[in-house]
Interface confidence: medium
């Protein structure tokens, strides 16, 4: 990481917990005000590797609802609208940060957690294994 | 949301701050231990809508390094390896949570922030606007 001079106005941290436990303001600042989600909302249907969106819900997690992509086909859709099995539809996965209530059912105590989610699908050339 | 009975062992919260400011344990729990394919798939090179990865750095954010996908072409790669402009390469975007140091340069005080990142690209049929 990068060394940053410490701001003298920082909240105190107890040595026994620091830096494991920190204070987090849950008033989310959204930096995406100029983005237009309407434009991308139908990619899952128009893609040559289309996907369905499945709702993953967990009340002990923040955010409690995460949408997961599942590719519709093993192959990709060709120009004729048929599935071409010479190509593969594969999920694009990303690790994301979520907050997990810890201890369970506590409204104001969380642990940072990383989970792997499928965001969408892309069409790839398969890896061909040649037999010697 | 779902109502969850409060755990009596939860840390106390001061009413004036609650529920805006919470305690978060930064010892990350990784839930992805079993999702470990033996091969790295290099989808960004093998996709019909290939992308480059760009490093987005911000020392005031956790995580401080985020990789962003940028589609290489406006069109998609066809079976001959050429760019087909009858199709479009588009970024698959996802909103993710990050922690922003607040006040700046504080090691143990953060604000939750949502940012939009491009995770990869997919090939879509373009929307054709017919002129009346």
């Amino acid at each position: 990481g990068i060394t940053i001079p410490r701001n003298p106005g920082c909240p105190n941290s107890e040595d026994k917990n620091f830096p494991r436990t920190v204070m987090v303001n849950l008033n989310i600042h959204n930096r995406n005000t100029n983005t237009n989600p309407k434009r991308s909302s139908d990619y899952y249907n128009r893609s040559t590797s289309p996907w369905n969106l499945h709702r993953n819900e967990d009340p002990e997690r923040y955010p409690s609802v995460i949408w997961e992509a599942k590719c519709r086909h093993l192959g990709c859709i060709n120009a004729d609208g048929n599935v071409d099995y010479h190509m593969n539809s594969v999920p694009i996965q990303q690790e994301i940060l979520v907050l997990r209530r810890e201890p369970p059912h506590c409204p104001n105590s969380f642990r940072l957690e990383k989970i792997l989610v499928s965001v969408g699908c892309t069409c790839v050339t398969p890896i061909v294994h040649h037999v010697a | 949301g779902i109502t969850i009975p409060r755990n009596p062992g939860c840390p106390n919260s001061e009413d004036k701050n609650f529920p805006r400011t919470v305690m978060v344990n930064l010892n990350i729990h990784n839930r992805n231990t079993n999702t470990n394919p033996k091969r790295s798939s290099d989808y960004y090179n093998r996709s019909t809508s290939p992308w480059n990865l760009h490093r987005n750095e911000d020392p005031e954010r956790y995580p401080s390094v985020i990789w962003e996908a940028k589609c290489r072409h406006l069109g998609c790669i066809n079976a001959d390896g050429n760019v087909d402009y009858h199709m479009n390469s588009v970024p698959i975007q996802q909103e993710i949570l990050v922690l922003r140091r607040e006040p700046p340069h504080c090691p143990n005080s953060f604000r939750l922030e949502k940012i939009l990142v491009s995770v990869g690209c997919t090939c879509v049929t373009p929307i054709v606007h017919h002129v009346a």
Epitope: E95 | I28, N30, S41, Y43, L53, H54, W67
Partner: antibody, heavy 120, light 110 residues
Framework: QVQLVQSGAEVKKPGASVKVSCKAS????????MNWVRQAPGQGLEWMGD????????IFNQNFRGRVTMTRDTSISTAYMELSRLRSDDTAVYYC?????????????WGQGTLVTVSS | DIVMTQSPDSLAVSLGERATINCKAS??????????MHWYQQKPGQPPKLLIY???NLEAGVPDRFSGSGSGTDFTLTISSLQAEDVAVYYC????????FGGGTKLEIK
């Protein structure tokens, strides 16, 4: 062919500064990050930071606590790394290495290394 | 920072035999299906040389007895048939976050 040629060995006293240069040839200088990696005698590799020659942006490893400065001169395709307030444990071979701006950032060519000895 | 743990620290293998070096990251170093893990070989008095990039891709000019595998947190460098010129120190490197290297594995001939 791609080459990264570094300046010669240096002997410095504790508290002094050293500036090492890395001249690039055989590729477009502004298409690659220039990284600096050091290796103390008999030890492993430690990344110090990098510079984006396109805009001069730098990122540093926190272990160097503001002692390192990275600059570049695009007109002569040369990157520089200056380390100040030298200590005896800064004695090491310092390498420059390039990595493409479009990621994912492996170091495909390295300079020959510059030995910096810090001794009173 | 992501901590890279290499094992073993040193390894003695007979000529023509297989050598395997492991690297474990303290957190996942895969992004969108790409392992941001790379392997280098360093011989005495020389700079490191890139062998494998993005977990499993062989750098141009590197003999195909070298191979890499793995994803997430666990990666492996394999030399299928050890040659005398492979005696060196091998390092793994992650570039998921600011780059960090493993501690190195010294490979010798038994």
């Amino acid at each position: 062919q791609v080459q990264l040629v570094q300046s010669g060995a240096e002997v410095k006293k504790p508290g002094a500064s050293v500036k090492v240069s890395c001249k690039a040839s055989g590729f477009t200088f502004t298409d690659y990050y220039m990284n600096w990696v050091r290796q103390a005698p008999g030890q492993g590799l430690e990344w110090m930071g990098d510079i984006n020659p396109k805009n001069g942006g730098t990122i540093f490893n926190q272990n160097f606590r503001g002692r390192v400065t990275m600059t570049r001169d695009t007109s002569i395709s040369t990157a520089y790394m200056e380390l100040s307030r030298l200590r005896s444990d800064d004695t090491a071979v310092y390498y420059c290495a390039r990595s493409i701006l479009t990621g994912p950032f492996y170091f495909d060519y390295w300079g020959q290394g510059t030995l910096v000895t810090v001794s009173s | 920072d992501i901590v890279m743990t290499q094992s073993p620290d040193s390894l003695a293998v007979s000529l023509g035999e297989r050598a395997t070096i492991n690297c474990k990251a303290s957190q996942s170093v895969s992004f969108a299906g790409t392992g941001l893990m790379h392997w280098y070989q360093q011989k005495p008095g020389q700079p490191p040389k890139l062998l494998i990039y993005r977990a499993s891709n062989l750098e141009a000019g590197v003999p195909d007895r070298f191979s890499g595998s793995g994803s997430g947190t666990d990666f492996t460098l394999t030399i299928s048939s050890l040659q005398a010129e492979d005696v060196a120190v091998y390092y793994c490197q992650q570039t998921m976050e600011y780059p960090t290297f493993g501690g190195g594995t010294k490979l010798e001939i038994k």
